[in-house]
Amino acid sequence: RQQWELQGDRRCQSQLERANLRPCEQHLMQKIQRDEDSYGRDPYSPSQDPYSPSPYDRRGAGSSQHQERCCNELNEFENNQRCMCEALQQIMENQSDRLQGRQQEQQFKRELRNLPQQCGLRAPQRCDLEVESGGRDRY
């Protein structure tokens, strides 16, 4: 690989290490849980995450905070689409264990793809969000 590519990867890696993607994860979980609540899911089901949205938060209160902070973090990757994709993949990987069932996973993935656009940022064109134990062909 060319030297600039290696440097780019290293720069992306350090950017990812300094990014706080938790607000993005919380924001997306709130979105899909709010959608499920409106379809009759029990909003008071317990969660292992200390900062997961309370039933009160899920109805919309507090969610703009996660979104604002999330967008600030994603904005740091705006001029590096490849790195933006890595960030989205990291969010997917971090939350994959918490997603219950194929339907919730697909919903989360759909919301995740829309996230950059929701923040007024350019979405990476090709970004594989499949979570597999093996290697991923990202581009």
């Epitope: 938790r22 938060d57 209160a61 905070q65 996660h66 604002e68 600030n72 904005n75």
Partner: antibody
Framework: EVQLVESGGGLVQPGGSLRLSCAAS????????MNWVRQAPGKGLEWVSS????????YYADSVKGRFTISRDNAKNSLYLQMNSLRDEDTAVYYC????????????????WGKGTTVTVSS | EIVLTQSPGTLSLSPGERATLSCRAS???????LVWYQQKPGQAPRLLMY???TRATDIPDRFSGSGSGTDFTLTISRLEPEDFAVYYC?????????FGQGTKLEIK
Amino acid sequence: EVQLVESGGGLVQPGGSLRLSCAASGFIFSDYNMNWVRQAPGKGLEWVSSITRSSRTIYYADSVKGRFTISRDNAKNSLYLQMNSLRDEDTAVYYCAREDFDVSTGPYYMDVWGKGTTVTVSS
Amino acid sequence: EIVLTQSPGTLSLSPGERATLSCRASQSVSNMFLVWYQQKPGQAPRLLMYGASTRATDIPDRFSGSGSGTDFTLTISRLEPEDFAVYYCQQNGNSPYTFGQGTKLEIK
């Protein structure tokens, strides 16, 4: 030692300008969001402005919007606050503060503060 | 903007007593974005709690934080002489990142 040192404060007339600087040492400056917070004599803390790691997102308190400009130079490990059209009510100690977050759970907080620099606006 | 109101304005207690400080938000604040700071005269603020209930490094376990939504509480179980100071809550989720007006904890 992790340290923030503010400078540039002083006495200025209403309508005047001042540029505050904050020199960071002991940590990788470009890895952190930074904030300015002020405290008027005998009053509470007031958040003034924040800037993200690569300066892509900047926020201001309504009270300073359009008059103050936050900036940073990662190569020089420095944070700045350009203050124009100063008013009596801008008289305060100005603190520079580093913002970090809990890697495992995500909450943000200002964990390192400078000792502050005093700005006095008076005729 | 989110307005944070702290109460009481001043709390007069003796060492060994329990202190309960309140922070009320004008709209819901996620626990993730609620922070408490301590400030002593002539000093810069010091980080105390973040995420509403997580103690910062080197903060003794007599300090605890709780609450959610619009009501948050900082509790000091047994006051030590060095705990007498001004305490501020702050939300850092929505800009502007507002502070409460502070609660002064003084020796009775």
